[in-house]
Interface confidence: low
């Protein structure tokens, strides 16, 4: 039943070309190249992709042709290293080309930039987009893949093909509609928001694999799949976990053709065996490939089997606990995690992993004790505080969210996190705190039983964004510590951080708080970001400012913006009233 055990192929590139088809092959190679060389112009990438595709076709025709036996890493790496401007554009990344495989590919992976210096994507007018779409549909869609891939170098490639398919469908439908904008813009907004979420979720998977290893990823997958498929047997879940780990290892490692091919095989296997996996898969399995894979990944949890026995019998009361643990530690812990997770769809995956870790630590200690059973008899009691901590935190924060609304809730988190880690750059603090704040509208609407898996697993994704951005330019040993010590304890680690008493406040710089009339033409979201940027800077200047002081200054600031945006001579208003506001704020904060 091993889905991925294939016969050896004389030509790997021919094999993948035949499996995937020309369209998907070209799209995946474009994504791979754009994720590696994030600064290269679109036209250069298209040229490289066309050259690789032509070569692949010669190998399909004759697998024994020259170079067809080379690995995909060798073929793609050689192609990337032909880029003339590699040294000027990418600096030291060009040194990768002096290495041999597999070191060369590892080198390219290390140079992927989570925050590339690229201009913000500005959406053209609807008519302009529709004209471009009709003039050259293929180029238009390739451009979409290229722009997303270079800005999100860990985007899950087969899923990006699904997004591109929806993107194409939106333009096909809406460019014929009477009101093109009303039809298209909501669809593009939805794709943008879903795309950002998808990118962030995949970034956590890759961080888990790359920073904490395959064991950490497999543990996550056991917990999540056991919640989703509680009727499936442990052996079935283990098989799915092994296959899923292979798929994500490949995608995170830049092996996008293998990843897409293996993901398709996994979807096929799941659908062929849905009777022994889940009753919720029927609709998914009737869809075409890309939609099918996406649907399976998002499928709701199946119902828990009735009358599941108590966990204590096998994992606490049994005299064979230490024997079973000693014989195959990871299998026994995997079974514990599977059994616990399938009974608790109401827990977050990270909580389940903390419980499994506590269980493992207890067995390590107790199985070496004089009376192991007496030692581990109360292990489940140790779980209580671990479960209550996220429950209480979510309860408090949902109450705060309901009281404040999203924008002010984000502001409360901005202040909280700036005081915890004031060394982190202002744009990062704003981005991360805004995303943390979205947990309110995303999860607090759910009933208790769904709040924790929604909230804490979402927070894990957002805090991973902080971790990967901070890793590029480490500025805070507290962030480094929370990000690197334990994947599952990142959120509790950040929650436990108090105000950083060692932080030396930033010197006051009036320029930071100087605003111009251009703020009046910004969208509401962009205006919020401006105000939130000012709030972070205020806290960096005055970390001991009280909530009341900050609220007063921010209220004054909002009134100032509103007043000057209504003025006839906006620029003069911003200049004159701005000086007064800065002076008043300094006085209010005692700067």
């Amino acid at each position: 039943r091993g889905v991925f055990r294939r016969d050896a192929h004389k030509s790997e590139v021919a094999h993948r070309f035949k499996d995937l088809g020309e369209e998907n092959f070209k799209a995946l190679v474009l994504i791979a190249f754009a994720q590696y060389l994030q600064q290269c112009p679109f036209e250069d990438h298209v040229k490289l992709v066309n050259e690789v595709t032509e070569f692949a076709k010669t190998c399909v025709a004759d697998e024994s042709a020259e170079n067809c036996d080379k690995s995909l890493h060798t073929l793609f790496g050689d192609k990337l290293c032909t880029v003339a401007t590699l040294r000027e554009t990418y600096g030291e990344m060009a040194d990768c080309c002096a290495k041999q495989e597999p070191e060369r590919n590892e080198c390219f992976l290390q140079h992927k930039d989570d925050n590339p210096n690229l201009p913000r994507l500005v959406r053209p007018e609807v008519d302009v987009m529709c004209t471009a779409f009709h003039d050259n549909e293929e180029t238009f869609l390739k451009k979409y893949l290229y722009e997303i891939a270079r800005r999100h170098p860990y985007f899950y490639a087969p899923e990006l093909l699904f997004f591109a398919k929806r993107y194409k469908a939106a333009f096909t439908e809406c460019c014929q509609a009477a009101d093109k904008a009303a039809c298209l813009l909501p669809k593009l907004d939805e794709l943008r928001d879903e795309g950002k979420a998808s990118s962030a979720k995949q970034r956590l998977k890759c961080a888990s694999l790359q920073k904490f290893g395959e064991r950490a990823f497999k543990a996550w997958a056991v917990a999540r799949l056991s919640q989703r498929f509680p009727k499936a047997e442990f052996a079935e879940v283990s098989k799915l976990v092994t296959d899923l780990t292979k798929v994500h290892t490949e995608c995170c490692h830049g092996d996008l053709l293998e990843c897409a091919d293996d993901r398709a095989d996994l979807a096929k296997y799941i659908c062929e065996n849905q009777d022994s996996i889940s009753s919720k898969l029927k609709e998914c399995c009737e869809k075409p490939l890309l939609e099918k894979s996406h649907c399976i990944a998002e499928v709701e949890n199946d119902e828990m089997p009735a009358d599941l026995p108590s966990l204590a019998a096998d994992f606490v009361e049994s005299k064979d606990v230490c024997k079973n643990y000693a014989e195959a530690k990871d299998v026994f812990l995997g079974m514990f995690l599977y059994e616990y997770a399938r009974r608790h769809p109401d827990y977050s995956v990270v909580l389940l992993l903390r419980l499994a870790k506590t269980y493992e630590t207890t067995l390590e200690k107790c199985c070496a004790a004089a009376d192991p059973h007496e030692c581990y008899a109360k292990v489940f009691d140790e779980f209580k505080p671990l479960v209550e901590e996220p429950q209480n935190l979510i309860k408090q924060n949902c109450e705060l969210f309901e009281q404040l609304g999203e924008y002010k809730f984000q502001n409360a988190l901005l202040v909280r996190y700036t005081k915890k880690v004031p060394q982190v750059s202002t744009p990062t603090l704003v981005e991360v705190s805004r995303n943390l704040g979205k947990v309110g509208s995303k999860c607090c609407k759910h009933p208790e039983a769904k709040r924790m898996p929604c909230a804490e697993d979402y927070l894990s994704v957002v805090l991973n964004q902080l971790c990967v951005l901070h890793e590029k330019t480490p500025v805070s040993d507290r962030v480094t510590k929370c990000c690197t010590e334990s994947l599952v304890n990142r959120r509790p680690c950040f929650s436990a951080l108090e105000v950083d008493e060692t932080y030396v406040p930033k010197e006051f710089n009036a320029e930071t708080f100087t605003f111009h009339a251009d703020i009046c033409t910004l969208s509401e979201k962009e205006r919020q970001i401006k105000k939130q940027t000012a709030l972070v800077e205020l806290v960096k200047h005055k970390p001991k400012a009280t909530k009341e002081q900050l609220k007063a200054v921010m209220d004054d600031f909002a009134a100032f913006v509103e007043k000057c945006c209504k003025a006839d001579d906006k620029e003069t208003c911003f200049a004159e009233e701005g000086k007064k506001l800065v002076a008043a704020s300094q006085a209010a904060l005692g700067l």
């Epitope: 600096g91 030291e92 750059s425 890793e471 500025v475 040993d477």
Partner: antibody, heavy 119, light 111 residues
Amino acid sequence: EVQLVQSGAEVKKPGESLKISCKGSGYSFTNYWIGWVRQMPGEGLEWMGIIYPGDSDTRYSPSFEGQVTISADKSISTAYLQWNSLKASDTAMYYCARLHGVVSRGDYWGQGTLVTVSS
Amino acid sequence: QSALTQPASVSGSPGQSITISCSGISSLAGSYNLVSWYQQYPGKAPKLIIYEVTKRPSGVSNRFSGSKSGNTASLTISGLQADDEAEYSCSSYAGRNAVAVFGGGTQLTVL
């Protein structure tokens, strides 16, 4: 190719001010920290402080806090180290280095600027 | 006064191996392997030879290797050559203000 080129040697009197420079080229100057290192005659190396030219975020080692000022002008890819009032004990060779992250390695170094302070 | 302690000098004959120690690595620097080694010839700028405890920049001979045990990092030079004679300094993240510190430096003499 990555290069850090420092300004030439300086001979100054105690109490005078001085600003030495370090110009980066061959890489994205705003994306890497620049560190300044002092080496007094016959002595070891000492990290003085670091700056991130992208946003001018600056950190000083405790023993150099208040003694020197580190700054940068990203428009000309140049970092600076300055003294308002030199002392004889500031006589040393000063190096700038490009850093990978705050806490990591200095992979490219300037050639050094010799500062001599003597009455 | 440096927070990292190195021997003032070590010596060895051509072909031998020598090890230079660097003690006082903070637990944070140790956990995340934030230790570098630099080689410096008289009148020249330092050159990075080891980073993140064990890694060598491209172009640095594999005769240079790094390791760490507890709060002590070590630099080993095998197959000693005359042009290895130089000053060697370790550097580590200090945690305070996120600025690194250097060891006092070790003068290597090739006999």
